[in-house]
Amino acid sequence: PSGLVTANITDSEALARWQPAIATVDSYVISYTGEKVPEITRTVSGNTVEYALTDLEPATEYTLRIFAEKGPQKSSTITAKFTTDLDSPRDLTATEVQSETALLTWRPPRASVTGYLLVYESVDGTVKEVIVGPDTTSYSLADLSPSTHYTAKIQALNGPLRSNMIQTIFTTIGLLYPFPKDCSQAMLNGDTTSGLYTIYLNGDKAEALEVFCDMTSDGGGWIVFLRRKNGRENFYQNWKAYAAGFGDRREEFWLGLDNLNKITAQGQYELRVDLRDHGETAFAVYDKFSVGDAKTRYKLKVEGYSGTAGDSMAYHNGRSFSTFDKDTDSAITNCALSYKGAFWYRNCHRVNLMGRYGDNNHSQGVNWFHWKGHEHSIQFAEMKLRPSNFRNLEGRRKRA
């Protein structure tokens, strides 16, 4: 073979391409190795002219070799060198956001770095850049403007190599969050009464959404996204209805999967479930909660249980949402159809909070298995979410 080149190089992948041998060959043997990286050898068909190299180490110079085989004969080896990109830092987060200061934190990339370039920019176009040392994983921003949206970006540096930038968006506080993105921000604005509020997805005034805020449970700041209390609302609804939401926010309702996706895409959220039945109460909190977009069929992530109701959501973690007209569960039967509800079903449920109100038949009702089992329909249930770092925000607000 000849003309060995690499293309589409990222921090973990590259595409090797070559001109085929003039003679017909049985196979090509490709090997690649880098400093401190064991050699990997792969054999591919003789009519192949490219090969995807995967699981590469970032910021590493690799030597790529290829030769052709035909029977016992081997061609001469051709060689190419390439260097993988520097991988990006991860999880850039703005915390301790005050009116004029904020703390940026991040996780380092896998590759060693010689420093980081931090860029932060306000909506009025003011840009500041700072280079920090390789062992730094946080940086305090000062002299910010109050009530201002900022975009902070960070890029890892290693000599001439520069990673892709990652970014986070935050808003410095004034007296109020002008466009609260969730109920926690509404609460930090001083609103402490449970009820209907307008939030702005991603703090965008064009993305207004009316929600019910629970401002009392465990410190408040919760967006309620499901309530069951009397059986007046029909929860045996189709995919379109569950995507959009339905019901009366003051009564029984479902906020909508599209809204949940947009809210949980704003940052790290926690889930709280409150249950009541004949004077008994129970709760479950999950410190990581998110809902994917429509392409993932609103895939659920729920981790980090604490509470008194029992960890019934663990069974549903990683599942896509199912309704009677869109069956995404792992059962042969349609769980939503079988149990007259909708949920992130598996095969089928530990939790069925959108089940038939008051139905005590096995698995048909409003169930939370590890509290009341599958043969008792719970009288009152709410699911709600707020940022995982709410406690920190609340504490700082009180100090301020």
């Epitope: 663990a314 069974y315 973690n317 059962a331 042969i332 095969n347 096995h362 599958h374």
Partner: antibody
Framework: QVQLVESGGGLVQPGRSLRLSCAAS????????MHWVRQAPGKGLEWVSG????????YYADSVKGRFTISRDNAKNSLYLQMNSLRAEDTALYYC?????????????WGQGTMVTVSS | DIQMTQSPSSLSASVGDRVTITCRAS??????LNWYQQKPGKAPKLLIY???NLETGVPSRFSGSGSGTDFTLTISSLQPEDFATYYC?????????FGQGTKVDIK
């Protein structure tokens, strides 16, 4: 690759104690529930005990409750079963098993087992 | 505790046969059922989880079905390496319980 290796089995007299260990490798140990399942010679499988990924929750079969204690050391990727007041009916091959993600009550990886014989 | 009853307890079959093993739970367990294969002197191996889902790496001739209380494991065309003992297990509630096993041997 994912691997579980049990140790600590042996011959023990009734009423005495034994501690089984299971060394895990190839996966993020503290993400998964772990279990002990036993099989008496020529018999079927019997679940003995389980423990959550954090170690905060433990579960036991009635036949061993109060006598056996399951524990884990996530720093060492190790699972343990402390067996006290052993009886002849505890004689079995003891398997360590990894739970799947989520509830962890399905066993997707098993060790090769360690034999416990309780006899005078 | 939930009792799991398998039938038959043993069966003889030839290579290429279609084999069906049933498992019945003493109470309703939705689809919280798993199937394992155990060969002599070896640890059990997970075949099917959640009643009908094939574990990664398990040949497609194995399939599972059922929900509620009645479940079936089917081997569409028995292969020499399939002669073993098969166990069902409910993961619906603690204690997780196994069926008594079905031994599949050569006719």
């Amino acid at each position: 690759q994912v691997q579980l290796v049990e140790s600590g089995g042996g011959l023990v007299q009734p009423g005495r104690s034994l501690r089984l260990s299971c060394a895990a490798s190839g996966f993020t140990f503290d993400d998964y529930a772990m279990h002990w399942v036993r099989q008496a010679p020529g018999k079927g499988l019997e679940w003995v005990s389980g423990i959550s990924g954090s170690g905060g929750s433990t579960y036991y079969a009635d036949s061993v409750k109060g006598r056996f204690t399951i524990s884990r050391d996530n720093a060492k990727n190790s699972l343990y079963l402390q067996m006290n007041s052993l009886r002849a009916e505890d004689t079995a091959l003891y398997y360590c098993a990894k739970g799947t993600r989520g509830e962890g009550d399905t066993f997707d990886i098993w060790g090769q087992g360690t034999m416990v014989t309780v006899s005078s | 505790d939930i009792q799991m009853t398998q039938s038959p307890s043993s069966l003889s079959a030839s290579v290429g046969d279609r084999v069906t093993i049933t498992c019945r739970a003493s109470q309703y367990i939705q689809g919280f059922l798993n199937w394992y294969q155990q060969k002599p002197g070896k640890a059990p191996k997970l075949l099917i989880y959640d009643a009908s889902n094939l574990e990664t790496g398990v040949p497609s001739r194995f399939s599972g079905s059922g929900s509620g209380t009645d479940f079936t494991l089917t081997i569409s065309s028995l292969q020499p390496e399939d002669f073993a003992t098969y166990y069902c297990q409910q993961s619906y509630s603690t204690p997780q319980t196994f069926g008594q096993g079905t031994k599949v041997d050569i006719k």
